[in-house]
């Protein structure tokens, strides 16, 4: 595969990663698929420094990140360990709230208006952030 050495047009480089900030909304799964088709993933926040960077770019707007518990435990989309990793939940969150009346609980994490995290209904059409790492060889499969 080929290595990505610089960010695509309209992406922002920061600490050897590239970030793309949507200005429109999609359900979490559609945002996840969108990022994958860009050879990226929904943003995975691994440090306070990265949290502040993303927060600066998204402003006070609900925005999906690459964290969900749709299959039970909380998981980052790139496999980063959740239990030992960086967290920035709002107080009392995540709460898997069922009182919204939309069916089920809340399985997808997003940045809230103050940057801290909340779990919400995955179908809500929030903005999203894609991330891809520089110097990572693209996984181009061999042709059979």
């Amino acid at each position: 595969g080929s290595e990505r050495t610089c960010c695509p047009v309209n992406w922002v480089e920061h600490e050897r990663s590239c970030y793309w900030f949507s200005r429109s909304g999609k359900a979490w799964a559609d945002a996840d698929n969108y990022c994958r088709l860009e050879d990226a993933h929904l943003v995975v926040v691994t440090s306070w420094e990265e949290q502040k960077f993303v927060q600066h770019h998204i402003g006070p707007v609900n925005t999906w990140m690459g964290l969900h518990d749709q299959n039970g435990p909380w998981k980052w989309v790139d496999g980063t360990d959740y239990e030992t990793g960086f967290k920035n939940w709002r107080p009392e969150q995540p709460d898997d709230w069922y009182g919204h009346g939309l069916g089920g609980g809340e399985d997808c994490a997003h940045f809230t208006d103050d940057g801290r995290w909340n779990d919400d209904v995955c179908q809500r059409p929030y903005r999203w952030v894609c991330e891809t790492e520089l110097d990572k060889a693209s996984q181009e499969p061999p042709l059979l």
């Epitope: 080929s2 309209n10 429109s24 359900a27 945002a31 088709l37 860009e38 050879d39 181009e140």
Partner: antibody
């Protein structure tokens, strides 16, 4: 000039296989996700499959899942669609289409001329 | 999947007429709506993306509007080269993009 040129269509019996190709030129092929869209005779357009620029991510319509495979060779600027276990309802003109995306803008901005696939005994 | 329904399925009009085609989504798609034109024996051509943005080179007599579930393609003054089939397409649901069934614009 940005161009897509499909080939590989033809007549095949039910249960048979066919491999379509799409040769791209005039743009940085590896930077774009590519799609196959089909149109049955006298019918509308149906999205079939998409592959990311690197080839690492693929998706399929339910109607072809498990039977069709999409792939690409970025060194040859070529997109492929391997069609197995073909059925009469797969009869259509198959178009390759370049995806251009930027949030709100998520479109098929360039299309090939199409290649006709007929599944019949 | 999100279903897209166009109306009418066909219409007859004269050169100079104002033509309106509507497209309805089975659920809200915000402004993720594109329009394509297809002439017989040819590949589709992108006309309008994200509801109202005209693709480069598309004449200004074409316009799009709407939001949520209801959308409209308008041709302000129909020209001979506009006789074709028009398709709407939603791009909200990635990647299960779906098209309307098409509207054929014929010469009266």
């Amino acid at each position: 000039e940005v161009q897509l040129l499909e080939s590989g269509g033809g007549l095949v019996q039910p249960g048979g296989s066919l491999r379509l190709s799409c040769a791209a030129s005039g743009f940085t092929f590896s930077s774009y996700a590519m799609n196959w869209v089909r149109q049955a005779p006298g019918k509308g357009l149906e999205w079939v499959s998409v592959i990311s620029g690197s080839g690492g991510t693929t998706y399929f319509a339910d109607s072809v899942k498990g039977r069709f495979t999409i792939s690409r060779d970025n060194s040859k600027n070529t997109l492929y669609l391997q069609m197995n276990s073909l059925r009469a309802e797969d009869t259509a003109v198959y178009y390759c289409a370049k995806r251009n995306s930027s949030g709100w803008h998520d479109v098929f901005d360039i299309w090939g001329q199409g290649t006709k696939v007929t599944v019949s005994s | 999947d999100i279903q897209m329904t166009q109306s009418p399925s066909s219409l007859s009009a004269s050169v100079g007429d104002r033509v309106t085609i509507t497209c309805r989504a089975s659920q809200s798609i915000s402004r993720y709506l594109n329009w394509y034109q297809q002439k017989p024996g040819r590949a589709p051509k992108l006309l309008i993306c994200s509801t109202s943005s005209l693709q480069s080179g598309v004449p200004s007599r074409f316009s799009g509007s709407g939001s949520g579930t209801d959308f409209t393609l308008t041709i302000s003054s129909l020209q001979p080269e506009d006789f074709a089939t028009y398709y709407c397409q939603q791009s909200y649901s990635t990647p299960t993009w779906t098209f309307g069934q098409g509207t054929k614009v014929e010469i009266r």
